[in-house]
Interface confidence: low
């Protein structure tokens, strides 16, 4: 017989020879990382027809790495379904926890046994340092030194020393998020005041007031015979300017060949009626809405 068969899980005991006599026996053993479970034979004999008697490595089983439980507050996920060497174990932590240690362990061979490539990680709680302090404002829980995952703080602005209040620009509430970072940048407290929006040949239809602070919104419509060039709705933004810019009311062309541009406002336009009584936040009827009431 020529050289005996080779196997994935089993190896020849001793050195192979180029030829074997009829009746000669060879013995196998399980390779490193495999263990033997009887009763299947691990030897074969050179038969008189110069072939080896049937033998297989089915009695050799792969060594397995020890079972690893889910980490507390996390999960261990077996990438390829078994604990045999070559396996990968992936670790993830529950929401609100972060991993201390390696996120993947490999089942490796060391000498004759399968062992994990390292120690299982731990899932520890996500903590944040205190959020930033801001000028002209403060946040809740300012005395707390360490915040847990999803703990939130709310910012507010201090009373302003002058006639105009501080406006809070940005997110008023931020929370401790993943990677131990806050969900948003700290907001800013500053005076934001836009000039009174004057639109000649037009009128305000909402957002009446003497002063226009951050996020104040005003809507306009044009007088009859005029069309709106720009947006019918403007907002006072953090740099104390209107966005979009204050629109203009332009005269509608009477030429029969030109089509009148239409207002950018969609839908029917409400008619303006001055308030019958002086509601708070509305101009007095005799002040009119086109007067510049900006202080």
């Amino acid at each position: 017989c020529e050289a005996p068969p080779t196997f994935e899980a089993m190896e020849l005991i001793g050195k192979p020879k180029p030829y074997y006599r009829v009746g000669e026996r060879v013995d196998y053993k399980c390779k490193k990382g495999y263990f033997y479970i009887p009763p299947l034979a691990t030897h074969t004999i050179c038969d008189r027809n110069h072939t080896w008697l049937p033998v297989s490595d089915e009695g050799c089983y792969r060594e397995m790495c020890p079972h690893i439980r889910d980490p507390l507050n996390g999960e261990a996920i077996l990438a390829n379904g078994s604990y045999e060497f070559g396996a990968e174990l992936h670790f993830i932590c529950n929401e609100g926890y972060y991993l201390i240690g390696k996120d993947i362990l490999y089942c490796e061979l060391k000498d004759t046994v399968a062992i994990w490539s390292g120690k299982p990680p731990l899932c520890e709680k996500i903590l944040c340092t205190p959020p930033p302090k801001i000028k002209n404002g403060k946040h809740t829980f300012s005395e707390v030194e360490v915040f847990e995952y999803l703990d939130a703080v709310t910012y507010s602005c201090d009373p302003a020393p002058g006639p105009d209040p501080f406006s809070l620009i940005g997110e008023s509430m931020i929370y401790c998020g993943n990677n131990s970072t806050w969900s948003h940048a700290a907001p800013e407290c500053k005076v934001v005041k836009c000039r009174f929006p004057v639109v000649e040949n037009g009128k305000q239809i909402s957002g009446f007031g003497k002063k226009f602070y951050y996020k104040a919104t005003v809507m306009f419509e044009c007088d009859k015979g005029y069309y709106l060039n720009g947006s019918d709705k403007i907002v006072c933004e953090s740099n104390s300017t209107w966005d979009p810019p204050v629109p203009k009311c332009l005269k509608v062309s009477t030429s029969p060949t030109t089509k009148s541009p239409t207002s950018s406002a969609s839908g029917p336009r409400p008619t303006y009626k001055p308030p019958v009584s002086n509601y708070p936040g509305y101009p007095k009827p005799d002040e009119g809405i086109l007067n510049n009431l900006d202080d």
Partner: antibody, heavy 116, light 109 residues
Framework: QVQLVQSGGGVVQPGRSLRLACAAS????????MHWVRQAPGKGLEWVAV????????YYADSVKGRFTISRDNSKNTLYLQMNSLRAEDTAVYYC?????????WGRGTLVTVSS | QSVLTQPPSVSGAPGQRVTISCTGS?????????VHWYQQLPGTAPKLLIY???NRPSGVPDRFSGSKSGTSASLAITGLQAEDEADYYC?????????FGGGTKLTVL
């Protein structure tokens, strides 16, 4: 205020049972592993049992295995320790504690005295 | 007999530096598991002092620090104060079991 409020301690005869409770206020415990730790009079701390956040995994110290059962009712925000077949050596202050690898919040403790 | 070994007592004068050792084995501290430290003032529940070998939770002064090397760890307290007089416990983990040292009584002279 975040705290763990314990109840259920007292004097009990050997062989009898007792159930301890630990109610959380100011935090929701269903995201956290919870433990019981005990301290015999004048002795050190001894870890007793842990339960995972979802209640699926429970581990016990060898000294209480088969006698004590840890459980939790996340809807009530409460942790329990059912102690059966009590022995004199179980006499201790029992603390509930929150955390994973370490215990970052502890109850005030409840004294269990096993005596005939 | 605790699996983690601590000296039963240590002492120091106010302002001094003291250290408390915690010796484990290759199956706990030496296996890469973190060491945590707890302070127990007389008549009160333990309080987390150091977690993850050397991290301080909120409210713990930076006079307290922890370190770990091989199979042992230590807690250092600098600028000793009268209110530091307490029992100190180290803690670690192995195979589903949480371990405590026997505790060390710190006396401020």
């Amino acid at each position: 205020q975040v705290q763990l409020v314990q109840s259920g301690g007292g004097v009990v005869q050997p062989g009898r049972s007792l159930r301890l409770a630990c109610a959380a206020s100011g935090l929701t415990v269903n995201n956290y592993a919870m433990h019981w730790v005990r301290q015999a009079p004048g002795k050190g701390l001894e870890w007793v049992a842990v339960i995972s956040y979802d209640g699926n995994n429970k581990y016990y110290a060898d000294s209480v295995k088969g006698r004590f059962t840890i459980s939790r009712d996340n809807s009530k925000n409460t942790l329990y320790l059912q102690m059966n077949s009590l022995r004199a050596e179980d006499t201790a202050v029992y603390y509930c504690a929150k955390g994973g690898g370490y215990f970052d919040l502890w109850g005030r403790g409840t004294l269990v005295t096993v005596s005939s | 007999q605790s699996v983690l070994t601590q000296p039963p007592s240590v002492s120091g004068a106010p302002g001094q530096r003291v250290t408390i050792s915690c010796t484990g084995s290759s199956s706990n501290i030496g296996a890469g598991y973190d060491v945590h430290w707890y302070q127990q003032l007389p008549g009160t529940a333990p309080k987390l002092l150091i977690y993850g070998n050397n991290n301080r939770p909120s409210g713990v002064p930076d006079r307290f620090s922890g370190s770990k090397s091989g199979t042992s760890a230590s807690l250092a307290i600098t600028g000793l104060q009268a209110e530091d007089e307490a029992d100190y416990y180290c803690s670690s983990y192995t195979s589903g079991t949480w371990l405590f040292g026997g505790g060390t009584k710190l006396t401020v002279l």
